[in-house]
């Protein structure tokens, strides 16, 4: 249905990392434009990205209002230059997105090792608490603020001279691990939300090694 020169959007896909959330779709428009609407299951539709020739729409501002809600979006197709035109049923063509629950589905961004400090045979490794676009009281919340103890970090650490990766876990942003005196170690961290069934892990942080700038060594 619809006018002869418009086609419905398809392959509607949510792309979301640390709550930065974009809806993408196909096809690239030929003589047509798109408008996106988003709603919670029980809420009203809100229009975004009016009459755009893009095939993506940033919906971050809407989903961060309540990241635990489930959202649905739809993409309307209109003839270019004649956006009042409707399909044969009296409505413009549109396609629904899959449902999306940011808290459960947003990908965890690549973490960063902020610092590490060696004191004797102990090393303290600190993970940067990344800021998200989720706001409370006009303040941007960190990943830890949003997820609390649902978020853990896995630390992989290994002797520079070895390949086997030992692991440690924390539900804060700090690790305190035992190391062998006189050995240099390398570190990488991964964010994990164990309670999830999908998108449980982030990609690994860049590897940081002792003897490089980030760390500090103190002999006791």
């Amino acid at each position: 249905s619809g006018t002869t020169n418009t086609v419905a959007a398809y392959n509607l896909t949510w792309k979301s990392t640390n709550f930065k959330t974009i809806l993408e779709w196909e096809p690239k428009p030929v003589n047509q434009v798109y408008t996106v609407q988003i709603s919670t299951k029980s809420g009203d539709w809100k229009s975004k990205c009016f009459y755009t020739t893009d095939t993506e729409c940033d919906l971050t501002d809407e989903i961060v209002k309540d990241v635990k809600q489930t959202y649905l979006a739809r993409v309307f197709s209109y003839p270019a230059g004649n956006v009042e035109s409707t399909g044969s049923a009296g409505e413009p063509l549109y396609e629904n997105s899959p449902e999306f629950t940011p808290y459960l589905e947003t990908n965890l961004g690549q973490p960063t090792i902020q610092s590490f400090e060696q004191v004797g045979t102990k090393v303290n490794v600190t993970v940067e608490d990344e800021r998200t676009l989720v706001r409370r009281n006009n303040t941007f919340l960190s990943l830890r603020d949003v997820f609390g103890k649902d978020l853990i970090y896995t630390l992989y650490y290994w002797k520079s001279s070895s390949s086997g990766k030992k692991t440690a876990k924390t539900n804060t942003n700090e690790f305190l691990i035992d190391v062998d005196k006189g050995e240099n170690y390398c570190f990488s961290v991964q964010a994990v939300i164990p309670s999830r069934t999908v998108n449980r892990k982030s990609t690994d942080s860049p590897v940081e090694c002792m003897g490089q700038e980030k760390g500090e060594f103190r002999e006791i």
Partner: antibody, heavy 120, light 107 residues
Framework: EVQLVESGGGLVQPGGSLRLSCAAS????????IHWVRQAPGKGLEWVGY????????YYADSVKGRFTISADTSKNTAYLQMNSLRAEDTAVYYC?????????????WGQGTLVTVSS | DIQMTQSPSSLSASVGDRVTITCRAS??????VAWYQQKPGKAPKLLIY???FLYSGVPSRFSGSRSGTDFTLTISSLQPEDFATYYC?????????FGQGTKVEIK
């Protein structure tokens, strides 16, 4: 339903090689960690090693280091244990197991095991 | 590596008995201890995680506790299906290590 199914066990001569497979269903292995644990006849459980299939990181028990290699094929949702230079003391039932990955829960699901016998 | 010393290695008990199995870690492992049950020819099954939390579907007669580096598995009233071997395991550091096992037999 979460399931782990090991295969590839059998009789092998000392010094020989064998590759065990662990086919997972009901979950995506790259979202978890996979361990191999073995049990010699009439003995207790011995941890062999782990892999994080999302990045290929591994760690091995000293008793198998340099002889055993764990790998994973995420497209097949399967983990492997390549065993080289096998010894009589490697005779055991080999289990693959899923690591839930939280601070609290460690291994929550196990396969049924596959028997490896090293004998001449 | 951390050693987990489990005792006793075996015990005989009757249905309805209270059974206690202990595991001692060679160093601090916080609460990162699990208990598994294994029956002959079968894979182990998770009973207790994080020292004292009952895993989903496990009967409430099983319980776990911690005192420093000592960990205890208790079966409050032994049932016929509980005759099996029990293992503790620490996962505080790599490599994770198991206790030697405790075989619970019928008296």
């Amino acid at each position: 339903e979460v399931q782990l199914v090991e295969s590839g066990g059998g009789l092998v001569q000392p010094g020989g090689s064998l590759r065990l497979s662990c086919a997972a269903s009901g979950f995506t292995i790259s979202d978890y960690w996979i361990h191999w644990v073995r049990q010699a006849p009439g003995k207790g459980l011995e941890w062999v090693g782990y892999i994080d299939p999302s990045n290929g990181y591994t760690y091995y028990a000293d008793s198998v280091k340099g002889r055993f290699t764990i790998s994973a094929d995420t497209s097949k949702n399967t983990a492997y244990l390549q065993m080289n230079s096998l010894r009589a003391e490697d005779t055991a039932v080999y289990y693959c197991a899923r690591d839930y990955g939280s601070l609290q829960v460690f291994i929550d699901y196990w396969g049924q095991g596959t028997l490896v016998t090293v004998s001449s | 590596d951390i050693q987990m010393t489990q005792s006793p290695s075996s015990l005989s008990a009757s249905v309805g008995d209270r059974v206690t199995i202990t595991c001692r870690a060679s160093q601090d492992v916080n609460t990162a201890v699990a208990w598994y049950q294994q029956k002959p020819g079968k894979a182990p099954k998770l009973l207790i995680y994080s020292a004292s939390f009952l895993y989903s579907g496990v009967p409430s007669r099983f319980s776990g506790s911690r005192s420093g580096t000592d960990f205890t598995l208790t079966i409050s009233s032994l049932q016929p299906e509980d005759f099996a071997t029990y293992y503790c395991q620490q996962h505080y550091t790599t490599p994770p290590t198991f206790g030697q096992g405790t075989k619970v037999e019928i008296k």
